[in-house]
Interface confidence: medium
């Protein structure tokens, strides 16, 4: 059974999970077009399911896309470069997710763009973090 | 429980390279970042850069960009901090990591590399 | 980078006062402050994650508090084993930084 302890270490490496994927949807949002429009015809692959820490193998399988895009948009509307912001999401997901287990990630038929691809994942740690409060 | 053990101390002449070994026991290495750290005698913490060793991915502080190399061998779940082209005023003690978010819960021991003609 | 300011950079104090130590970031770090206490010739310890939280194993006289820039570490009533150099850190961006240290002194 998880302790107190281990509860309040996994909140907040998930609040700061979505403070990044916050901060990257936030960056998007403030493109001027025609960036946005050519970001949003890049297509990532949305989990069928995500509903437990396990599942953010499917996060992180779309990281290197991810990154990807960001590089390819250039922004200054980060403070950490591409990078840097990917690679502290990937140690919060390893750690959050461990590596004792392996787990095959289940996606859904349709794609998604960017924009949803973050808000689904902003939603499920919003959805966790309620869990552990 | 995780333990991080280090290489013994080094005594190296500027213009040297250095490498420092730390090997987990106990525990999972993988999943989480391997970081280095630094402290000159009488001087603070000083970060120098990561490692997260399932995916080989690292990061380093500006400073010491293209003077330190990390890496890490998951078979011996040992990671590695080389230092080149040493100079007096990285006599220090080095020390490597365990963690990010939730602050660094596993060290080293610590190694001291003293940099001497 | 962030820069974290450490205030005092030492103090003298008594065993059972009760000790206060601030530090304070350059931007806003939300909660992602942490606090180490080092001994002489050891590796630094870490006591508080995320500003508040005790890490598992360290005495209750501990305390962190704070968010955004300002955060304070309370121990309540010093005790012998406390004399000691302690840190803050940040680990909300890349590169993670530290406070300059704090001596805990005797009186």
């Known amino acids: 059974a998880p302790t107190s302890s281990s509860t309040k270490k996994t909140q907040l490496q998930l609040e700061h999970l979505l403070l990044d994927l916050q901060m990257i949807l936030n960056g998007i949002n403030n493109y001027k077009n025609p960036k946005l429009t050519r970001m949003l015809t890049f297509k990532f692959y949305m989990p069928k399911k995500a509903t437990e820490l396990k599942h953010l193998q499917c996060l992180e399988e779309e990281l290197k896309p991810l990154e990807e895009v960001l590089n390819l948009a250039q922004s200054k509307n980060f403070h950490l470069r591409p990078r840097d912001l990917i690679s502290n999401i990937n140690v919060i997901v390893l750690e959050l997710k461990g590596s004792e287990t392996t787990f095959m990630c289940e996606y859904a038929d349709e794609t998604a763009t960017i924009v949803e691809f973050l808000n689904r994942w902003i939603t499920f740690c919003q959805s966790i973090i309620s869990t552990l409060t | 429980q995780v333990q991080l053990v280090q290489s013994g101390a080094e005594v190296k002449k500027p213009g040297s390279s250095v490498k420092v070994s730390c090997k987990a026991s106990?525990?999972?290495?993988?999943?989480?970042?391997i970081n280095w750290v630094r402290q000159a005698p009488g001087q603070g913490l000083e970060w120098m850069g990561r490692?997260?060793?399932?995916?080989?991915?690292?990061d380093y502080a500006q400073k010491f960009q293209g003077r330190v190399t990390i890496t890490a061998d998951e078979s011996t779940s040992t990671a590695y901090m080389e230092l080149s082209s040493l100079r007096s005023e990285d006599t220090a003690v080095y020390y490597c990591?365990?963690?990010?978010?939730?602050?660094?819960?596993?060290w080293g021991q610590g190694t001291l590399v003293t940099v001497s003609s | 980078d962030i820069q974290m300011t450490q205030s005092p950079s030492s103090l003298s104090a008594s065993v059972g006062d009760r000790v206060t130590i601030t530090c304070r970031a350059s931007?806003?770090?939300?909660?992602?402050l942490n606090w180490y206490q080092q001994k002489p010739g050891k590796a630094p310890k870490l006591l508080i994650y995320?500003?508040?939280s005790l890490q598992s194993g360290v005495p209750s006289r501990f305390s962190g508090s704070g968010s955004g820039t300002d955060f304070t570490l309370t121990i309540s009533s010093l005790q012998p084993e406390d004399f000691a150099t302690y840190y803050c850190?940040?680990?909300?961006?890349?590169?993670?930084?530290f406070g300059q240290g704090t001596k805990v002194e005797i009186k």
């Open positions: 990591a365990r963690g990010f978010v939730g602050g660094f819960d596993v």
């Open positions: 106990g525990g999972t290495f993988t999943s989480y970042a």
């Open positions: 490692i997260i060793p399932i995916i080989g991915r690292v």
């Open positions: 931007q806003d770090i939300s909660n992602y």
């Open positions: 995320g500003a508040s």
């Open positions: 850190q940040q680990t909300y961006t890349i590169p993670l930084t």
